[in-house]
């Protein structure tokens, strides 16, 4: 089997550890990239025919070029990061409380502050800081990377030649943590939404607190929930139509459990999408509304879908499911106009439902234009 994910996670480790290169430390970042390239070359024999391999190779080429890295030069050694304790450092590691975030948190604070990140549709990203972006991010991208877990998504074009992409694969790595959980990997793909980790298990393994990590199938093949109580985290993965959606509720303390903030620029839930990967879908929305369906193709970041909706039909479809004209509604209209796939209405609807369930601040369920990301903000 292809082990390209191992290369990906080694690269994440090398670029987000305590001794990781800062964003301006190009020689060290280039060394990490060369290591990543070497790792992918080693896996070529068993991965060369797979999309994940080619996505990694192209991603490396892009990053090498962006950072002006030479192909020859030193490489970095993969580092294993040590995980900080999830609670009071005096606590015995075999205590069941260490595997229950809220119980251990309450020992030294009031109530944890929870944050939310979601990815759905074309894809639209809601960051931990409630910024809302529409992104291209084709290929494999890290959504979350902290001391406790990694989440990587792979996005593929919705239509041939389109800048609009949607999530076709999701990999979540829950890192080995004290007496609570063994390392567990969850992987979902289009038409493959398992209710188990890749090793077939449904909890955190054989450790004392293994049940602090659990997978529950809510709707077979369509909706899975993963509870990671040891880090106070809930993840919802759905398949809506052909594509996947992701939503997470995570304590701020866990979100911020990164060892070098300067090296976290690549992680979408934290920093959002890079500026060159963002689509100004609201300008598109205004353009489509103002000029009507006939001029739509000119405004579209993608080739017009084979059976695209007239603007009025898209609006009507989205209003059925999303009565409040917020950014989720606008995302819905955008997705229908760019793809012609009515399932994107449901993707926006379920994304909003997941926000209702996972977001701790009920005043922030709906986002409106004034809170959108302005050009120039990273």
């Amino acid at each position: 089997p292809c082990k390209i994910l191992k290369c990906n996670s080694e690269f994440w480790s090398a670029t987000s550890g305590s001794h990781a290169p800062a964003s301006d430390d190009t020689p060290e970042f280039c060394a990490a990239l060369r290591s990543y390239a070497l790792c992918t070359r080693r896996t070529a024999r068993t991965c060369r025919g797979d999309l994940a391999y080619h996505s990694a190779v192209h991603g490396i080429e892009d990053l090498m070029s962006q950072h002006n890295c030479s192909k020859d030069g030193p490489t970095s050694q993969p580092r294993l990061r040590t995980l900080p304790p999830a609670g009071d450092s005096q606590e015995r590691s075999d205590s069941p409380e260490i595997c229950h975030y809220e119980k251990s948190f309450h020992k030294h604070s009031a109530t944890p502050n929870y944050t939310h990140c979601g990815l759905f549709g074309d894809p639209h990203l809601r960051t931990f800081t409630d910024r809302f972006q529409t992104c291209k991010v084709q290929g494999a991208w890290p959504l979350i990377d902290n001391n406790y877990l990694n989440v990587q998504v792979t996005n593929t074009p919705v239509l041939p030649g389109s800048a609009a992409t949607a999530t076709s694969k999701l990999t979540i790595i829950f890192k080995n943590f004290q007496e609570c959980v063994d390392q567990k990997v969850y992987q979902a793909e289009m038409d493959e939404l398992p209710a188990a980790f890749v090793d077939g298990s449904k909890n955190g393994g054989d450790k004392h607190g293994a049940n602090s990590l659990k997978i529950t199938e809510k709707v077979s093949g369509q909706h899975v929930e993963i509870q990671a109580k040891y880090i106070g985290t809930t993840i919802v993965v759905r398949q809506v139509g052909r594509y996947l959606t992701f939503a997470v509720r995570m304590p701020e303390e866990v979100v911020n459990a990164v060892e070098d903030w300067d090296s976290q620029g690549l992680y979408l839930c934290l920093r959002g999408c890079p500026l060159n990967q963002q689509i100004d879908f609201q300008a598109f929305h205004t353009n489509a509304e103002g000029t009507g369906a006939r001029r739509l193709a000119a405004a579209s970041p993608a080739p017009t879908a084979p059976e695209t909706f007239p603007y009025e039909t898209a609006v009507a479809k989205c209003k059925e499911k999303l009565p409040v004209e917020d950014l989720y509604y606008q995302a819905c209209v955008f997705d229908l106009l760019t793809t012609g796939d009515v399932n994107f209405t449901l993707a926006a609807y379920y994304a909003l439902e997941d926000v209702k369930m996972l977001h701790s601040n009920k005043d922030k369920l709906h986002l409106y234009e004034r809170t959108r990301d302005l050009p120039g903000r990273a």
Partner: antibody
Framework: EVQLVESGGGLVQPGGSLRLSCAAS????????MNWIRQAPGKGLEWIGM????????HYADSVKGRFTISRDNSKNTLYLQMNSLRAEDTAVYYC????????WGQGTMVTVSS | DVVLTQSPLSLPVTLGQPASISCRSS???????????LEWFQQRPGQSPRLLIY???NRFSGVPDRFSGSGSGTDFTLKISRVEAEDVGVYYC?????????FGQGTKLEIK
Amino acid sequence: EVQLVESGGGLVQPGGSLRLSCAASGFTFSNYGMNWIRQAPGKGLEWIGMIYYDSSEKHYADSVKGRFTISRDNSKNTLYLQMNSLRAEDTAVYYCAKGTTPDYWGQGTMVTVSS
Amino acid sequence: DVVLTQSPLSLPVTLGQPASISCRSSQSLEYSDGYTFLEWFQQRPGQSPRLLIYEVSNRFSGVPDRFSGSGSGTDFTLKISRVEAEDVGVYYCFQATHDPLTFGQGTKLEIK
């Protein structure tokens, strides 16, 4: 659950042609390289060839090069093996398998080349 | 082409006893810095082959821990710590380091 179902096998005369299909489900077919492997009656396994996820490259065993062609239709989640100029020694069960190197296999389809 | 030679070709084993199958390659299967693409497959009677071990020693998903693989370079071994009735079948080694990919000729495991 990964499922691969081969079809199209049967009896064919030497020099004849046959096209095998492999219908894939339970995984994202368009993300993976795919292989064809065969097994002559009572014999061992022989790798025939593989195709990249996007059909950009194909690799074949010398024994079938120039006679067999592997193709795929990602929109139909289907892998194909076009076999021309068939010989008696091509008689075998033909398996399709997922991955650049095979991990999950289909149940196989029997091809008999005989006059 | 890389030739993989398995021994023994037939292996009668008593239930509960260990079993060992050797696979020798005509050239080194090390691809790069210790990456060696040698796999083991099991084919039960009337069934399709099933992947047991990849990259010499890694058990594939769902494979019992009584199966283990070892070796390097040109010499490889598949071990079954305690043979069970369901282990009956033919075992093949397979290399993916060099094109064309090749299989060993198979070892038939049967119960004494």
